[in-house]
Amino acid sequence: MGVEGCTKCIKYLLFVFNFVFWLAGGVILGVALWLRHDPQTTNLLYLELGDKPAPNTFYVGIYILIAVGAVMMFVGFLGCYGAIQESQCLLGTFFTCLVILFACEVAAGIWGFVNKDQIAKDVKQFYDQALQQAVVDDDANNAKAVVKTFHETLDCCGSSTLTALTTSVLKNNLCPSGSNIISNLFKEDCHQKIDDLFSGKLYLIGIAAIVVAVIMIFEMILSMVLCCGIRNSSVY
């Protein structure tokens, strides 16, 4: 006999929640695998005119994305299938996975906070490499896309450490539309914006992490309540 009433509501809530989670994981995994195997991105990851690699952080970053996507799909599947099948075993596994993920998130948050200066340095280095690739190699479309994404996200243009290149980037339509005059240029230094993000705007990253943590706790509670509901309904 299946669960009834409020528990049934929780069952479908958990199903929908985890189906969305599973889909998001699929998208992340798909994008990460595409980034890993797309020749242009591989060039960007190794960023080579010669054979000098990009910062290890970003090479590893692709594999972290693949792992995150795979884990999200796996956990999403456990939650989805466990809820719809009303399986205590799957829901128990789902709960355990969430506890582990929660612990990982807390650990990653602490590590990120402790190493924020190094991460900011790596992000700046990656940005500089993409910026150079975008100017030096006319066919580096992925590098151009990376540069454009940085510029639009941070509302900046170029780097004061690469002044000559920045003037070229400016005219290649890779900067926000307001900054098309060279004399305005270095008011919008991306290095400064990256530093600001990792110091002044660190609270935004913190809020995002807290939101994810709250969702995880919420899912843990829902899975436990559903598990108890299933156990109780099987008694009668």
């Epitope: 010669g50 000098k52 190699d137 006319d138 002044t163 000559a164 070229s168 005219k171 290649n172 005059i181």
Partner: antibody
Framework: QVQLQQSGPELVKPGASVKISCKAS????????MNWVKQRPGKGLEWIGR????????IYNGKFKGKATLTADKSSSTAYMQLSSLTSEDSAVYFC?????????????WGQGSALTVSS | DIVLTQSPASLSVSLGQRATISCRAS??????????MHWYQQKPGQPPKLLIK???YLESGVPARFSGSGSGTDFTLNIHPVEEEDAATYYC?????????FGTGTKLEIK
Amino acid sequence: QVQLQQSGPELVKPGASVKISCKASGYTFSSSWMNWVKQRPGKGLEWIGRIYSGDGDAIYNGKFKGKATLTADKSSSTAYMQLSSLTSEDSAVYFCAREGKTGDLLLRSWGQGSALTVSS
Amino acid sequence: DIVLTQSPASLSVSLGQRATISCRASKSVSTSIYSYMHWYQQKPGQPPKLLIKYASYLESGVPARFSGSGSGTDFTLNIHPVEEEDAATYYCEHSREFPFTFGTGTKLEIK
């Protein structure tokens, strides 16, 4: 193929001004950077500055600010360099040189040079 | 401004031998992935011609006997084997920052 055709030799008096032209063909003039380089007789090369032909935005070597003015005319695909308050120190061959299409900071194609003699 | 000093000022090399020209910058012209140092060849009465870009990459159409190396502040242009038509003045140039500057030049003579 890319060609840069510069104006002919000039003989001018000290204190006067001169405008050297560089007509481009074989590529999209309006989305490229044009550089100007000075070479005095028997001497090395000096970078004067570069101009983006699309909007006339120019960057100068501090040494030539006030001396050289770079302009570009998209309709005729021609870049110009005006030199003012001429002295004997300005007697030189002046080259225009085009960068690659991304503005790759490489002087890939050069004009044949325009000789300027400043003498009274 | 970055000052580029070339050595030697002039060089005489026998046909088929190796010619080596050095260029030293007053500060680094390299980043983690590129060196913004380029080499040009100029023959009398002609404009300069790009030979080597980003320290070690041959410009298309340039013979493979030309090669470049170096990073940071020290760069080298090698020509091997030297041919008659290589008699010219060679300039290094950086585009790391404004203003771009050229080296003092090295005149190569073929014996």
